[in-house]
């Protein structure tokens, strides 16, 4: 299986909400001993590999933000913990999964990693990730709403607040 990022860069004004999105696709083993976890964490542009370092998002770890199920089922976190931090992660039946961040501040700027982990027999893990950058801007240079820049082309797209 693979993970694709729809957008590689999100530029947002302070105070706005944004939804970062990834897509999980490819052959999926729906065996009873296989579980998929989808989650998010912050990272930095590593010298060796992007997303190799992991840090919490607004003090929440990847385990606080994860969705887990077998195959391509829909799921979402409505945990009080995440919502108290202005965060919500969700996924649909088509392999899309996202994290919504509310009331952005400059401190939210940085590299975000989406991750899919396949676990067999509750032991070994196989993982694939995607990366995207969030730039939160303030002042006269900030856009009026979030602008998302596609991963594969230079065309930008205005995205509505979540």
């Amino acid at each position: 299986f693979k993970v694709a990022t729809l957008y590689s860069l999100y530029v947002c004004p302070e105070g706005q909400n944004v939804t970062l999105t990834c897509r999980f696709f490819g052959p999926v083993d729906k065996g009873h001993d296989v579980t998929f976890y989808k989650t998010w964490y912050r990272s930095s542009r590593g010298e060796v590999q992007t997303c190799s370092e992991r840090r919490p998002i607004r003090n929440l770890t990847f385990q606080d933000l994860h969705l887990h199920h077998g195959g391509h089922q829909a799921a979402n976190t409505s945990h009080d913990l995440a919502q108290r931090h202005g965060l919500e992660s969700a996924s649909d039946h088509h392999g899309n999964f996202s994290i919504t961040m509310r009331n952005l501040t400059l401190l939210d700027s940085g590299l975000y990693c989406c991750l899919v982990v396949e676990i067999r027999h509750h032991h070994s893990e196989h993982r694939v990730h995607g990366a995207m950058e969030l730039q939160v801007q303030t002042g006269k240079d900030a856009p009026s709403s979030c602008v998302a820049y596609p991963s594969s082309s230079q065309e930008s797209e205005n995205i509505t607040a979540a």
Partner: antibody, heavy 121, light 112 residues
């Protein structure tokens, strides 16, 4: 740089308990598992247990589940392993080690310097 | 539990020579989903903690000299040190992380 620094050597009597600490620095402590591994004199490595500091959830080798207790103090980025009902065969060097897994198992990329625990009457 | 067996227990080698260390697992540590072998090698010198050398059976950890190489798949693995330096005399452990964690008994590489 990423570092794990352990507490000093301990000498204990049989039946007592020992609590070893492992202080992490240079990375986000809450987001990586901490494992405990021991090595008896002249012997190989034996995995005891691990803990995810973000949640405090711990996972134990069956052999140690009744005697080992793992805890963390997130405010000081410190992990602890307490081993109770000590016997002479628990004499060993105890290591903490970080692993890079998310939900499964992974290799150990960073190790503490080790804490020698001697159990003797 | 997956059992790990290392051989020989002790290997006597002269500096500059090649050392070949063996590790066998009681069941395959190859994961079908990604075709990776969940096996690592560590080096341990007297009075020191183990140090990660190789993971995924053949990937060198950052900073590890290229005279160290890992090979093998499934249940049989080899760590090769192409030309032994004085600092390479140590004990080497293999470690499977496919299903919980188990280590081999170690191979001591000593000066001949």
């Amino acid at each position: 740089q990423v570092q794990l620094v352990q507490s000093g050597a301990e000498v204990k009597k049989p039946g007592a308990s020992v609590k070893v600490s492992c202080k992490a620095s240079g990375y986000s402590f809450t987001d990586y598992y901490i494992n405990w591994v021991r090595q008896a004199p002249g012997q190989g490595l034996e995995w005891i247990a691990r803990i995810f500091p973000g949640s405090g959830n711990a996972y134990y080798n069956e052999k140690f589940k009744d005697r080992a207790t793992l805890t963390v103090d997130k405010s000081t980025s410190t992990a602890y392993m307490e081993l109770s009902s000590l016997r002479s065969e628990d004499t060993a060097v105890y290591y903490c080690a970080r692993d890079d897994s998310f939900y499964g198992y992974w290799y150990f990329d960073v190790w503490g310097q080790g804490t020698t625990v001697t159990v003797s009457s | 539990n997956i059992m790990m067996t290392q051989s020989p227990a002790t290997l006597s080698v002269s500096p500059g020579e090649r050392a070949t260390l063996s590790c066998k697992s009681s069941q395959s540590v190859l994961y079908s989903s990604n075709q990776k072998n969940y096996l690592a090698w560590y080096q341990q010198k007297p009075g020191q903690a183990p140090r990660l050398l190789i993971y995924w059976a053949s990937t060198r950890e950052s900073g590890v000299p290229d005279r160290f190489s890992g090979s093998g798949s499934g249940t049989e693995f080899t760590l090769t040190i192409s030309s032994l330096q004085s600092e390479d005399f140590a004990v080497y452990y293999c470690h499977q992380y496919l299903s919980s964690y188990t280590f081999g008994g170690g191979t001591k590489v000593e000066i001949k």
